[in-house]
């Protein structure tokens, strides 16, 4: 907290500019109007004040604005941002796609903070929805953004802004966001070709569902080792031998280097051992030959 | 972090010269401007001189004409060249510097100026 004391004569600021640098922080408490401050923000930024006297400028826009800074005001604070508490940001009021690249251009390189959270947080609710080039300016600052989302807040995603995503925006995602970011993803794509379609698509595979990879295998897509890793247990498990080795084409030889991981460990027990054997690349494991497999699951349901 | 380490300072007669010199270490790649600030006895601090990452500097109208401020990149270290040095020039003068990282200032440990006959 700066004292009140009385600004020196021929010392109070007409104009923000480079000689307030070489005040003394009372003499910025004292001598620089906090509305010609708030009219000339965007003169702040272009001047190298130390974060010192920058806790000074903030301290005034503080008592002027109590309930929060107008965007005028917000769009042009530049390191002044990296000041601001998360406590403060929630008072703001952040509409302009333009004010939230401003900001997050001031946090570049750097992990998202807590202030730049709560920023995001409140300008994607004042929003309503994760529109595509709100998402495509995250992505472009934050690649693990979408992954940092709860798949609630993901389901506000709409389909239209699956086209900013690239894969390493993926990267860090579980597979209970990728569920709910597959199915908009597919009909994101919906109208592409073949290959194509499979390229878009190939990220967003950690949720589709079996039949969904069934359909894939009849394609000849050659899905790589690691995107067949990444595929839920669950939905990789009722493939038959021919389907996953259609699913994988040439990748199919990957499968021995994986056979204790899982889902393809999973698989193998699932599988007869003759028809592992068709494969030629001395996968053990699968159901000996004679034996009977019950499917218990589909018994419960009947009964 | 950043780390500085100011050195050159000393006893000085009136109209006299001195370099002062302060080397970073640590994240220097993160600075963004530097600066030069002075603290006379008793008094408090006064901000001299600063240099930008952009290379855009400025000095106190009180120094103005008589101090230099220099920044070589390539060896992390700001230069303070002090000409016709007067007795309110002395003072202890600072190295500090403010990054793109950390939202505080970093500051050396100081080197006194003093200018007496």
């Known amino acids: 907290e700066v004292e009140k004391t009385a600004c020196p004569s021929g010392k109070k600021a007409r104009e923000i500019d480079e000689s307030l640098i070489f005040y003394k922080k009372w003499e910025l408490e004292a001598c620089v109007d906090a509305a010609l401050l708030a009219t000339q923000m965007d003169r702040v930024n272009a001047i190298p004040f130390t974060y010192e006297q920058l806790d000074v400028l903030k301290h005034k826009l503080d008592e002027l604005y109590p309930q929060g800074y107008p965007e005028s005001v917000i769009q042009h604070l530049g390191y002044l941002f990296l000041k601001m508490s998360p406590e403060d940001i929630r008072k703001w009021n952040v509409t302009s796609l333009e004010t939230l690249k401003a900001l997050l251009e001031v946090n570049k390189g750097h992990e998202m903070s807590p202030q730049v959270a709560t920023l995001i947080d409140r300008f994607v609710k004042g929003r309503g929805q994760l529109d595509k080039d709100t998402l495509d300016t995250l992505t472009a600052f934050y690649p693990g953004y979408l992954c940092s989302l709860s798949p609630e807040e993901l389901s506000s995603v709409p389909p239209s802004s699956i086209w900013a995503v690239r894969p390493q925006d993926l990267d860090t995602c579980d597979p209970r966001q990728l569920d709910v970011l597959y199915p908009k993803a597919r009909l994101a794509f919906q109208n592409m070709n073949g290959s194509e379609y499979f390229v878009k698509i190939q990220s967003f595979l950690g949720g589709a569902p079996t039949e969904d990879l069934k359909a894939l295998s009849q394609q000849n897509v050659s899905m790589d080792l690691a995107t067949f890793m990444k595929l839920r247990t669950d939905a990789v498990l009722p493939l038959t031998v021919a389907e996953v080795q259609k699913l994988l084409g040439p990748h199919v030889e990957g499968l021995k280097a994986e056979e204790r991981h899982r889902p393809v460990r999973d698989w193998i027990l699932r599988q007869r051992q003759d028809d592992l054997d068709t494969l030629g690349l001395g996968l053990q494991g699968g159901i000996p030959n004679g034996y009977l497999v019950l499917d218990l699951s589909m018994q419960e349901a009947l009964s | 972090e950043v780390q500085l380490v100011e050195s050159g300072g000393g006893l000085v007669q009136p109209g006299g010269s001195l370099r002062l010199s302060c080397a970073a270490s640590g994240r220097t790649s993160t600075i963004d401007t530097m600066y030069w600030v002075r603290q006379a006895p008793g008094k408090g601090l006064e901000w001299v001189s600063y240099?930008?990452?952009?290379?855009?500097?400025n000095v106190a109208d009180s120094v103005k004409g008589r101090f230099t401020i220099s920044r070589d990149n390539s060896k992390n270290t700001l230069y303070l060249q002090m000409n016709s040095l007067r007795a309110e020039d002395t003072a202890v003068y600072y190295c500090s510097v403010r990054t793109t990282s950390y939202p505080v200032d970093f500051w050396g440990q100081g080197t006194l100026v003093t200018v007496s006959s």
């Open positions: 240099v930008t990452s952009r290379g855009t500097s």
